[in-house]
């Protein structure tokens, strides 16, 4: 299709080479197309003006994204050619930063229902650059935490070094929806609830004497509880002896509950004590079996191919640790009488 009629928007993504971050493009169809298309505002036939330029499908997923190759080749369907770019309804998610994401992205409805719809498209010209060293050293992170029940704020990473007074007007989105009240480089939250978690996007306009563009940053916000003040609990094994059959395989599970920590480095391991000797066992990787806002339960198993007489003399010790302290639970194997 002819993209010369598409409305055009220039965006700049300056990414930090020090951290992982994501980026999004919204299918910003011009009004009134956008309101009718992306937000399912179903109009009755009487309300539809004759000249409405676009009467697209109300299904949010009925948007097609393309990339325009710089060499003039035909448009490419994003879903077929770019595995690191994911389409979610009217939004395009870039999972990894890099200058190779620079280019022209076009979105339009899949269903063309009237002659007017042909021009119903947006061309977004995305420029991706590494962050300039002129930016301040302590710019806000693209991953920010809000402490539940307390006051907090979400900062726009590309503007976090500027004072509120000199900051340009900022447009904020949360999970793709416009936050029309917020206009500064920081969103202040009086009391943090779990619904404040989500993907926030901040946009502001930058220009030179010639043209202007939108500088965009994406912030992943999570709501968290305060760091635990407790060392981890071992939930299993509870007993310090375990009846086993000689010659049979055996799996002993160690399950531990770790309280939430912002910087979370849990340790869970098995070691064996035999007389005066003690050694760590290389066992399968630990896995998280339950994760909540407040804590995480992690499991790690020790596997014996077959229980031997020697194993009955040993103690199998599960050791768990967080930044507060450590806990151990030992298990002695006992032959089943039978």
């Amino acid at each position: 299709f002819n993209i010369s009629g598409c409305s055009t928007k220039k965006l700049l993504w300056t990414y930090s080479t020090r951290s992982e971050e994501e980026f999004v493009l919204f299918c910003d169809l011009p009004e009134p197309q956008k309101s009718h298309f992306c937000h399912r505002n179903r109009l009755s036939p009487k309300q539809v003006p004759e000249h409405l330029p676009f009467m697209g499908s109300n299904d949010l997923s009925d948007v097609q994204w393309y990339q325009q190759p710089s060499n003039g080749d035909p448009l490419e369907d994003i879903r077929k050619s770019y595995p690191h770019i994911i389409q979610d309804k009217c939004t395009l998610h870039f999972l990894t930063p890099g200058v190779n994401n620079s280019g022209s992205y076009i979105c339009r409805p899949k269903m063309i229902k009237s002659p007017y719809d042909v021009a119903c498209c947006v061309k977004m010209i995305l420029e991706v650059k590494p962050q300039t060293n002129a930016s301040c050293e302590y710019s806000a992170s693209h991953k920010q935490d809000l402490l539940l029940g307390s006051t907090g704020s979400i900062s726009c990473p590309s503007l976090s070094c500027q004072s509120d007074a000199q900051s340009p007007a900022v447009t904020w989105y949360k999970n793709g929806k416009l936050l029309s009240v917020e206009r500064s480089n920081r969103i202040v939250v009086d009391e943090v609830y779990d619904y404040h978690q989500g993907t926030y996007v901040c946009d502001y306009t930058q220009s030179d004497t010639v043209s202007s563009w939108t500088v965009r940053a994406v912030v992943q916000v999570r709501t968290i509880v305060g760091d635990t003040k407790l060392k981890p609990d071992i939930l299993d094994p509870v007993e310090d002896t375990l009846e086993v059959e000689l010659g049979k395989p055996l799996t002993i599970s160690c399950k531990a509950r770790f309280g939430f920590e912002r910087v979370f480095n849990p340790v869970i391991k098995w070691y064996i004590k035999d007389s005066d000797l003690e050694w760590e066992v290389s066992v399968p990787e630990a896995k998280s079996i339950k994760s909540t806002l407040k804590d995480e339960i992690i499991e790690r198993n020790i596997i014996l191919e077959k229980v031997t007489q020697r194993d009955l003399r040993r103690k199998f010790v599960c050791f768990v640790q967080n930044s507060i302290g450590n806990t151990t639970q030992s298990v002695q194997l006992k032959e089943k009488r039978g």
Epitope: K129, Q131, T132
Partner: antibody
Framework: SLEESGGDLVKPGASLTLTCKAS?????????MCWVRQAPGKGLEWIAC????????TYYANWAKGRFTISETSSTTVTLQMTNLTAADTATYFC??????????????WGPGTLVTVSS | AAVLTQTPSPVSAAVGGTVTISCQAS????????LAWYQQKPGQPPKLLIY???SLASGVPSRFKGSGSGTQFTLTISEVQCEDAATYYC??????????FGGGTEVVVK
Amino acid sequence: SLEESGGDLVKPGASLTLTCKASGLDFSSVYDMCWVRQAPGKGLEWIACIYSDGSGSTYYANWAKGRFTISETSSTTVTLQMTNLTAADTATYFCARVLNGWGEYYFNLWGPGTLVTVSS
Amino acid sequence: AAVLTQTPSPVSAAVGGTVTISCQASQSVYNNNNLAWYQQKPGQPPKLLIYTASSLASGVPSRFKGSGSGTQFTLTISEVQCEDAATYYCQGYYSGYINAFGGGTEVVVK
């Protein structure tokens, strides 16, 4: 604004460093900083540019490679080191900012220039 | 090497007339449209008039018009004013981070 300094009268074979100071500008990695010169009564001649993304990446006109070195000494200062100067290097040297993004490339801001004269 | 050839020079025009300056590139500019036009008056640095072949820089009167693609470009000044007397340069940007300026065209207004 951009302001050049360091222009001088030097003898052939000498070296000279020019400095470009930026002030009151929006810093963005879409801009590169460049040097362009103009011999008296002649046209504009591009010398070199440096990315302003902190990477230190540079690009030069073929004739300038080796004798001219562009570098960023701070986030607001760019220098041009010139060695083994000859009379042909006599010119006004302009510092210019170029927008390099969205498939566009143009010099959108220029300094007033600084005069370098090479004569014995 | 990338070479930009400007013709003619000098060119004279009467006030209210039209001036056309041509810029021929020895190879296609980047994206076929990365050509800019600058105006320079004596003792001053150049001033951007046109970028990406045909886009008018802000603050530049609409009587300046750029056109062309690939290797052949034109700057047209219609309804020439006295203040348009200056030297005009084209500048091309090429793949591989190469810049080149044309030799310049002096416009004399009578």
